[in-house]
């Protein structure tokens, strides 16, 4: 089951994928493309790399991570709900059936409206009490129970709490990391 | 206009060898992934053997491995599939395909027939 | 290795009707499904892939859908050229494994 990422209608998409080379430098080529991954390569590729470089990129996709280092993380930039879907980033690794394949699920939700001070009991009342943050499996949901009367100034403190205590493990330990060499 | 023509088909006897080829036109053969789908007469389509760009990976289906090798030459714009060891159960029309996963570009087959 | 059921076996359909063939597996394969159409002694061509994306000069009669375990290719309108034998393909396990067909002859 592939493992669900989130993001809202203007930001920048974040699909994480790592490796570790087996040698600083001794890159391993990665392809990253719209749809689950097939048997062999990528469908619709939108970014790959070779032994040295990037070498085939389309706009608004880019790696912003040091893929040198095996940071192959996939970026969209200024997501549409058109982006939605299941993206493959496949590791090439020399030999038969070598491949790791990872499919990622991107979930486009549309941008939030922020509420007039009026209102805020309204979005109170119809604001689900949960927040879905990036995990070890597919979208790990966070249940804040029964909280009678939050707020948006502590959901985005809840937030940035459960972004800032996991995202460096999140990120990480996504499921697409592997070890070469 | 791409094209792609299969050739060395013909009546073999049971256990004896083939080698089919299959020259390329009309786009970057070096740049394609190149595959081996066979259909037998009357059947449907199995695929049998790929190859990758550079002749690096090589991947058959478990019925004709050890028996079947699939090659390339670049240079030549060039596929080949040497059969050794034939099988009645090998007879068969063998398309050579452009693609990996699915094919885009086939030609138009030889018949190859192992009976005694 | 992973079968490929396609149904009906065959279909009776008169020039002009509508033509709606299934294939039909048993996990999930996304979107990575193909549908060829091929003619008595001729060799097969590629229509749609991505379960939906028609091929290079594929008229828009032809549409593909579904994803995960259950597909669909619809002709709109036969044509007296569509008479002809369907195949799906999937590619998203390995080996790579086609449907049965499915024989579309004229009503």
């Known amino acids: 089951s592939e493992v669900e990422y989130r993001a809202e209608v203007g930001q920048n998409a974040y699909l994480p994928c790592f490796y570790t080379p087996a040698a600083p430098g001794n890159l391993v080529p990665v392809c990253w493309g719209k749809g689950a991954c097939p048997v062999f390569e990528c469908g619709n590729v939108v970014l790959r790399t070779d032994e040295r470089d990037v070498n085939y990129w389309t706009s608004r996709y880019w790696l912003n991570g040091d893929f040198r280092k095996g940071d192959v993380s996939l970026t969209i930039e200024n997501v549409t709900l058109a982006d939605s879907g299941i993206y493959c980033c496949r590791i090439q690794i020399p030999g038969i059936m070598n491949d790791e394949k990872f499919n990622l699920k991107l979930v486009i939700k549309p941008a939030k409206v922020t509420p007039a001070p009026t209102r805020q009991r309204d979005f109170t009342a119809a604001f689900p009490r949960m927040l879905t943050t990036r995990g070890h499996g597919p979208a790990e949901t966070q249940t804040l129970g029964s909280l009678p009367d939050i707020n948006l100034t502590q959901i985005s403190t809840l937030a940035n709490e459960l972004r800032d205590s996991r995202l460096a493990n999140d990120l990480r330990d996504s499921g697409a990391t592997i070890r070469i060499g | 206009e791409v094209q792609l023509v299969e050739s060395g088909g013909g009546l073999v006897q049971p256990g004896g060898s083939l080698r089919l080829s299959c020259a390329a036109s009309?786009?970057?053969?070096?740049?394609?992934?190149m595959t081996w789908v066979r259909q037998a007469p009357g059947k449907g389509l199995e695929w049998v053997a790929n190859?990758?760009?550079?002749?690096?990976?090589?991947y058959y289906v478990d019925s004709v491995k050890g028996r079947f090798t699939i090659s390339r030459d670049n240079a030549k714009n060039s596929l080949y599939l040497q059969m050794n060891s034939l099988r009645a159960e090998d007879t068969a029309v063998y398309y050579c395909?452009?693609?990996?996963?699915?094919?885009?570009?086939w030609g138009q087959g030889t018949l190859v027939t192992v009976s005694s | 290795e992973i079968v490929m059921t396609q149904s009906p076996a065959t279909l009776s359909v008169s020039p002009g009707e509508r033509a709606t063939l299934s294939c039909r597996a048993r996990?999930?394969?996304?979107?990575?499904l193909a549908w060829y159409q091929q003619k008595p002694g001729q060799a097969p061509r590629l229509l749609i892939y991505?379960?939906?994306t028609r091929a290079t000069g594929i008229p828009a009669r032809f549409s593909g859908s579904g994803s995960g375990t259950e597909f669909t290719l619809t002709i709109s309108s036969l044509q007296s050229e569509d008479f002809a034998v369907y195949y799906c393909?999937?590619?998203?396990?390995?080996?790579?494994?086609f449907g049965g067909g499915t024989k579309v002859e004229i009503k």
């Open positions: 395909n452009s693609g990996s996963n699915y094919f885009d570009y």
């Open positions: 009309g786009f970057t053969f070096s740049n394609s992934w």
């Open positions: 190859i990758k760009q550079a002749g690096t990976e090589k």
């Open positions: 996990q999930n394969f996304y979107s990575n």
């Open positions: 991505g379960a939906s």
């Open positions: 393909q999937q590619y998203n396990n390995w080996p790579l494994t």
